[in-house]
């Protein structure tokens, strides 16, 4: 069955997953589709990478991590009910029926109303509506240009922390993680 | 210490081709990326294209497709790149130069000098 | 291609100030962006890349962050030997492309 991340509407979406490159010059090709990983490629591709570059992308997907170490994270941004579905990352692996597939469910909630976020400086206050859990809970993100006044040194700060400790050890743990060489 | 020496400057005729030089020490050649980039006089940097030693691939701008083509020559350690057709468009600086972290281009060549006149 | 918009293209300042060089690029490039500097006659110098990790051996004056599409570059306390051409670079997508450049001078 597909892991399942849950996302607001108007917020941006974030369908992890990640593979280990065997070496930096060898990047292994990437495809995220909507719809279930069929027996080859993606469907309906709305991202594509390549040995090197993300090679094609659609109005609105991109992928903020950093995909030349493995971190081929899906973002999709200002998301409406109509992204609701399963969306399939497939890793390219050279070979016969090597490649790895991933099914990741994503479930668009209404938007709610809240109050402006407080002045704290913990990762709450930074990213109000950024929830996280291990396992196959729910991931929520909202876009950089709606957060609270902090500087950019600070925002380039708390985005590295939260990417490096909690956030990628609770994706890596929801499965979508292969290891390549 | 790492180094991309490039070969020296050229003076070639309209339509001619060229072909200039990027010789690369200090470093395991086939584990990095050359890329190569355009300078016209006063003006900014144009990405041409790369080639990655350790397997011969090639990616270009399409905008130097048919005008640039990039090649390699493990043996020695040196990296080319052959410009076709010149006119006075071409006339420019060419940069080779190393992508190293986070795929930056961290070494570059001391540049060559390409001057297409009659 | 992806355009990244780089401004100022001329900066005229005097040796302690703080300057800030911005680009814009068109569309998301996430931290794919380095900031090259080119002094007269010499070959561009890699300064900071992935958007806000300072190259090895540049000095710390230098810094570099992301907010969004929008990237900037910034020299704490400008020193003369900062006489150059500035310029940011995204290879998220190829054709890697660069802004403009910004030329800093010196009062």
């Known amino acids: 069955s597909e892991v399942e991340y849950r996302a607001e509407v108007g917020q941006n979406a974030y369908l992890p997953c990640f593979y280990t490159p065997a070496a930096p010059g060898n990047l292994v090709p990437v495809c995220w589709g909507k719809g279930a990983c069929p027996v080859f490629e993606c469907g309906n591709v709305v991202l594509r990478t390549d040995e090197r570059d993300v090679n094609y992308w659609t109005s609105r997907y991109w992928l903020n991590g950093d995909f030349r170490k493995g971190d081929v994270s899906l973002t999709i941004e200002n998301v409406t009910l109509a992204d609701s579905g399963i969306y399939c990352c497939r890793i390219q692996i050279p070979g016969i029926m090597n490649d790895e597939k991933f099914n990741l469910k994503l479930v668009i909630k209404p938007a709610k109303v809240t109050p402006a976020p407080t002045r704290q400086r913990d990762f709450t206050a930074a990213f109000p509506r950024m929830l996280t859990t291990r396992g196959h809970g729910p991931a929520e993100t909202q876009t950089l240009g709606s957060l609270p006044d902090i500087n950019l040194t600070q925002i380039s700060t708390l985005a590295n922390e939260l990417r490096d400790s909690r956030l990628a050890n609770d994706l890596r743990d929801s499965g979508a993680t292969i290891r390549i060489g | 210490q790492i180094q991309l020496q490039q070969s020296g400057p050229e003076l070639v005729k309209p339509g001619a081709s060229v072909k200039i030089s990027c010789k690369a020490s200090g470093y395991t050649f086939t584990d990095y990326y050359i890329n190569w980039v355009k300078q016209r006089p006063g003006q900014g940097l144009e990405w041409i294209g790369w080639?990655?030693?350790?397997?011969?691939?090639?990616k270009y701008n399409e905008k130097f497709k048919g005008k640039s083509t990039l090649t390699v020559d493990t043996s020695s350690s040196t990296a080319y790149m052959q410009l076709s057709s010149l006119t006075s468009e071409d006339s420019a600086v060419y940069f080779c130069a190393r992508s190293g972290n986070y795929y930056a281009m961290d070494y570059w060549g001391q540049g060559t000098s390409v001057t297409v006149s009659s | 291609s992806i355009v990244m918009t780089q401004t100022p293209k001329f900066l005229l300042v005097s040796p302690g100030d703080r300057v800030t060089i911005t680009c814009r690029a068109s569309?998301?490039?996430?931290?794919?962006v380095a900031w090259y500097q080119q002094r007269p006659g010499q070959s561009p110098k890699l300064l900071i890349y992935y958007a806000s990790n300072r190259y090895t051996g540049v000095p710390d004056r230098f810094t570099g962050s992301r907010y969004g599409t929008d990237f900037s570059f910034t020299i704490s306390t400008v020193q003369a030997e900062d006489l150059a051409v500035y310029f940011c670079q995204q290879d998220y997508s190829s054709p890697y492309t660069f802004g403009g450049g910004t030329k800093l001078e010196i009062k």
């Open positions: 080639i990655y030693p350790g397997s011969d691939n090639t």
């Open positions: 569309q998301s490039v996430s931290n794919n």
